[in-house]
């Protein structure tokens, strides 16, 4: 079943079917005997009941109130009253564009992330029954589809897929042809989830150390979830058997981002462990960032300005 | 719509440098980083490093250290490639491409190298 | 560095056929941070830049037909045409984005028998 015409300003294009379904349908059908009216009101007319008679274009049924179609002198204030309901539309029809498929200002925006799922469904629920055909068009361009009964795009967006696309229902009614036209306006956008991945902390890290010991270099950062973080030391990681690199912990941020931490032992320090560079990369589709730690021993400590070590 | 676009052929003395650019357009310049893709005549691709868009950081091959420079102006959009010291091996059709999986190519730059 | 090595060095398939490219790496790109294995397949025809094919192992490039698909994880990984079309005449390259320098296979030459 149709949902109701629950918004009361509607704007329409001239020369297309068109239907107003009051909010109370369900109550209406039990109440069989009740009275139910549609009225109209425009400028300087009050409130005129509207029926068949009143127009050829109207058509009246249990709790809709059709045009076939609908034309710029049907703008005005329509009325559905039952008993001690009411409902009010402002209804806005405006000229059609006759030098393009869709009317400007009936077009329905949506932003596509690129690389996301991107559909375009050409359905038409109420008019269902009556609809001969539908195409779809691209820039006013047909698109050559398999379903011409609703044709659909399902694809991943891609930024060629950016334009309008207007879907056309073709449909007859005593004996005259009509269409329906629902054009989206489809912008695709970059990837606005990812971030630029940060590494936390100063770029160059002092750490004080003594000899013999044991020293856990730990490297954060805020990234993306298929960014990687990886420590980069010595002309070939994984020569010295006193480093380890432990397992990354991640913990997603409720933005939907990642905070990890990569942690570098270094147990049993030895000379060759001292002034060295170790680097705590993190790489994305963006590109790199890097961090370093060096070790230095205690004793050398008072060489250095005590705002870049870190413990 | 979206591309890069690369500067025309060139032609190059042994010795001398030559120096590729990479003009993006389309997209949002610094969320990729751009890549430089070198193909010998008859060759496979050589990933020859990479420049971080959003930060100047560079990782290069290490056969080409000392010789490649990567470098870009965000405010046109453009990765540049300078290589010096040519050698006739360095003969190759220059690519940029953009991100790690490289989803978008540039059209190719010849670059000869002949005495 | 890790070492991408491709096979065969050349295929004939014939038309409608099912083609296979493998690729080996040297060390594994995967990560267990996040189950994902970076590798991607590229299609390069004569006179023109390489095309992607596949990126993350096995999710396809929009716009790649669907007979194209990539699989396998950690060191070895599977380019598979369902069935083979003359326009599917061209070099095959996988390449890891895992670590720098981000390394390239041989190249892969397709032909139809």
């Known amino acids: 079943a149709e949902s109701c015409t629950s918004r009361p300003h509607i704007t329409v294009v001239e020369g297309e079917p068109f239907y107003l379904k009051h909010c109370s349908c369900s109550l209406a059908h039990e109440i069989e005997t009740t009275t139910k009216s549609w009225y109209k009101s425009s400028g300087s007319q009050e409130h005129v009941e509207l029926n068949p008679r009143s127009s050829s274009r109207i058509a009246l049924h249990d709790c809709v109130l059709e045009f076939w179609p609908v034309e710029l002198n049907d703008t005005g204030s329509y009325f559905f009253q039952m008993k001690n309901y009411t409902q009010k539309w402002k209804l806005n029809v405006i000229r059609r564009n006759k030098h393009s498929c869709f009317t400007e200002r009936q077009v329905t925006s949506k932003i596509v992330e690129v690389k996301k799922f991107f559909q375009i469904t050409c359905e038409n629920s109420y008019y269902q029954t009556l609809v001969n055909s539908t195409s779809l068009y691209k820039n006013c361009k047909k698109l050559l589809l398999e379903n011409n009964k609703n044709p659909t795009i399902k694809k991943n967006a891609e930024f060629e897929d950016q334009g309008y696309y207007s879907c056309v229902h073709f449909l007859h009614h005593n004996g005259k042809l009509f269409n329906i036209t629902k054009t989206f306006n489809i912008t695709i956008v970059e990837d606005r989830s990812n971030i630029v991945p940060v590494l936390l902390g100063p770029k160059l890290n002092h750490v004080a150390v003594e000899l013999g010991k044991n020293v856990r270099l730990n490297c954060s950062a805020l990234l993306n979830e298929e960014d990687v973080i990886y420590w980069m030391f010595g002309e070939e990681n994984g020569s010295d058997p006193n480093i380890h690199e432990e397992k990354e912990m991640r913990i997603m941020t409720p933005e939907g981002k990642w905070h990890a931490s990569k942690v570098l032992r270094i147990e049993n320090i030895g000379e060759s462990n001292l002034n060295v560079l170790y680097n705590c990369t993190v790489a994305s589709t963006g590109g790199t960032d890097t961090k370093s730690f060096i070790l230095v021993r205690k004793a050398d400590m008072a060489d250095i300005p005590g705002h870049v070590f870190t413990r | 719509q979206v591309q890069l676009v690369q500067s025309g052929a060139e032609v190059k003395k042994p010795g001398a440098s030559v120096k590729v650019s990479c003009k993006a357009s389309g997209y949002n310049f610094i969320s990729y980083g751009i890549s430089w893709v070198r193909q010998a005549p008859g060759q496979g691709l050589e990933w020859m490093g990479w420049i971080t868009t959003y930060n100047g950081n560079t990782n290069y091959a290490q056969k080409l250290q000392g010789r490649v420079t990567m470098t870009t102006d965000t405010s046109t959009s453009t990765a540049y490639m300078e290589l010096r010291s040519l050698r006739s091996d360095d003969t190759a059709v220059y690519y940029c491409?953009?991100?790690?999986?490289?989803?978008?190519w540039g059209r190719g730059t010849l670059v000869t190298v002949s005495s | 560095d890790i070492v991408m090595t491709q096979s065969p060095d050349s295929l004939a398939v014939s038309l409608g056929e099912r083609a296979t490219i493998n690729c080996k790496s040297s060390?594994?790109?995967?990560?267990?941070?996040?189950?994902?294995?970076?590798l991607a397949w590229y299609q390069q025809k004569p006179g023109q830049p390489p095309n992607l094919l596949i990126y993350?192992?096995?999710t396809r490039e929009s716009g790649v037909p669907d007979r194209f698909s990539g699989s396998g994880s950690g060191t070895d990984f599977t380019l598979t045409i369902s069935s083979l079309q003359a326009e599917d005449v061209a070099v095959y390259y996988c390449?890891?984005?895992?670590?720098?320098?981000?390394?390239f296979g041989q190249g892969t030459k397709l032909e139809i028998k």
């Open positions: 491409a953009r991100g790690w999986y490289f989803d978008l």
């Open positions: 993350w192992a096995s």
């Open positions: 390449q890891q984005y895992y670590r720098t320098p981000y390394t």
């Open positions: 060390q594994s790109v995967f990560y267990s941070s996040n189950n994902k294995n970076y």
